[in-house]
Interface confidence: medium
């Protein structure tokens, strides 16, 4: 399987909400023994690999984020902790799963890296990524909503495997 | 603050088993997998196998089937290990680990002795 | 399953000095881990995914490689460094670690 990135970037005025966005590609295992692991995290662009640090997104690790269920399972947080701090992941039947930051600031700008774990008990762990970028903005430059851009066909399919 | 808090060093007899705990605290027990290592006199570092307390589901090092054998009781976030037919190769220090799917083993126990003798 | 092999098994050096050592898998990784161990004390994370600090590590410590050769520098040597430092793999089942490097203090 791969991970699409549908928007590369997301450009957002201070005080707005967006929902960033990574969606599973190919064919999804739906046996009993393969479960999903699904989380967010901040990052920088790496010289050699995109996505490879784990930042926190507002203080939160990718730990405390995370989605586990089973194939085409739908999920979603409901750690107060998170919501506390504004944010909320969510996965749906169709292989879409998201993060929802609500009541943006400057300092929620950067780069954003979605990952996501199949694990196969007894066997193996396939792990792959998508990464997007986030840019807040404020006066009067800013747009009125959020603008997203179209991820390129090459870019949309961030692919890095375990 | 996370915590793994193992139960204390045990002496057992040869031939016996023995259940060694793990109490989770601090963290979602249900996000991560709990691991076991093995570290013999020799100081090498073994892997026993993994439980996921999720759904239950464990992978074991091959060469660890048949003498150990893992469960979790997610009520109480504890993870447990059963060594059986203890020999006096099995004596060693052994540690629970917690792992994020993906990552690595953050947070470690404090460990067990567990010494095999007559 | 797969081999790590780490060099040198003990090696020593003076405050300040720069340190590497080497971990070598029998065949290809993702991603080297890892971790370093005090006498009386648990394993401890420094480094995952090959080249990344793990929380609270200092920046004089760094890893890099691919394939099947991977490293652990210390750019400047400290008293408290001195450790058993050993490599872990999470590529293959069985996962393994390296029989360690010991360092010590000169």
């Known amino acids: 399987f791969k991970v699409a990135t549908p928007y590369s970037l997301y450009v957002c005025p201070e005080g707005q909400n967006v929902t960033l966005t990574c969606r599973l590609l190919g064919p999804v295992d739906k046996g009993h023994d393969v479960t999903f692991y699904k989380t967010w995290y901040r990052s920088s662009r790496g010289e050699v690999q995109t996505c490879s640090e784990r930042r926190p997104i507002r203080n939160l690790t990718f730990q405390d984020l995370h989605l586990h269920h089973g194939g085409h399972q739908a999920a979603n947080t409901s750690h107060d902790l998170a919501q506390r701090h504004g944010l909320e992941s969510a996965s749906d039947h169709h292989g879409n799963f998201s993060i929802t930051m609500r009541n943006l600031t400057l300092l929620d700008s950067g780069l954003y890296c979605c990952l996501v774990v199949e694990i196969r008990h007894h066997h193996s762990e396939h792990r792959v990524h998508g990464a997007m970028e986030l840019q807040v903005q404020t006066g009067k430059d800013a747009p009125s909503n959020c603008v997203v851009y179209p991820s390129s066909s090459q870019d949309s399919e961030n692919i890095t495997a375990a | 603050e996370v915590q793994l808090q193992q139960s204390g060093p045990e002496l057992v007899k040869p031939g016996a088993s023995m259940k060694i705990s793990c109490k989770a605290s601090?963290?979602?027990?249900?996000?991560?997998?709990m691991n076991w290592v093995k570290q013999s006199h020799v100081k090498n570092l073994e892997w026993i196998g993994l439980?996921?307390?999720?759904?239950?589901?464990?992978s074991y090092n091959q060469k660890f089937k048949g003498k150990a054998t893992l469960t979790v009781d997610k009520s109480s976030s504890t993870a447990y290990m059963e060594l059986l037919s203890l020999t006096s190769e099995d004596s060693a220090v052994y540690y629970c680990?917690?792992?994020?799917?993906?990552?690595?083993?953050?947070?470690w126990g404090q460990g067990t002795s567990v010494t095999v003798s007559s | 399953q797969i081999v790590l092999t780490q060099s040198p098994a003990i090696m020593s050096a003076s405050p300040g000095e720069k340190v590497t050592m080497t971990c070598s898998a029998s065949?290809?990784?993702?991603?080297m881990y890892w971790y370093q161990q005090k006498p009386g004390s648990s394993p401890r994370l420094l480094i995952y995914?090959?080249?990344n600090l793990a929380s609270g590590v200092p920046l004089r410590f760094s890893g890099s490689g691919s394939g099947t050769s991977y490293s652990l520098t210390i750019s400047r040597m400290e008293a408290e460094d001195a450790a058993t430092y050993y490599c872990q793999q999470w590529s293959s089942y069985p996962f393994t670690f390296g029989s360690g490097t010991k360092l010590e203090i000169k």
């Open positions: 680990a917690r792992r994020a799917y993906g990552y690595a083993m953050d947070y």
């Open positions: 995914d090959t080249s």
């Open positions: 439980i996921s307390p999720y759904n239950g589901g464990t």
């Open positions: 601090g963290f979602s027990f249900t996000g991560y997998t």
């Open positions: 065949s290809s990784v993702s991603y």
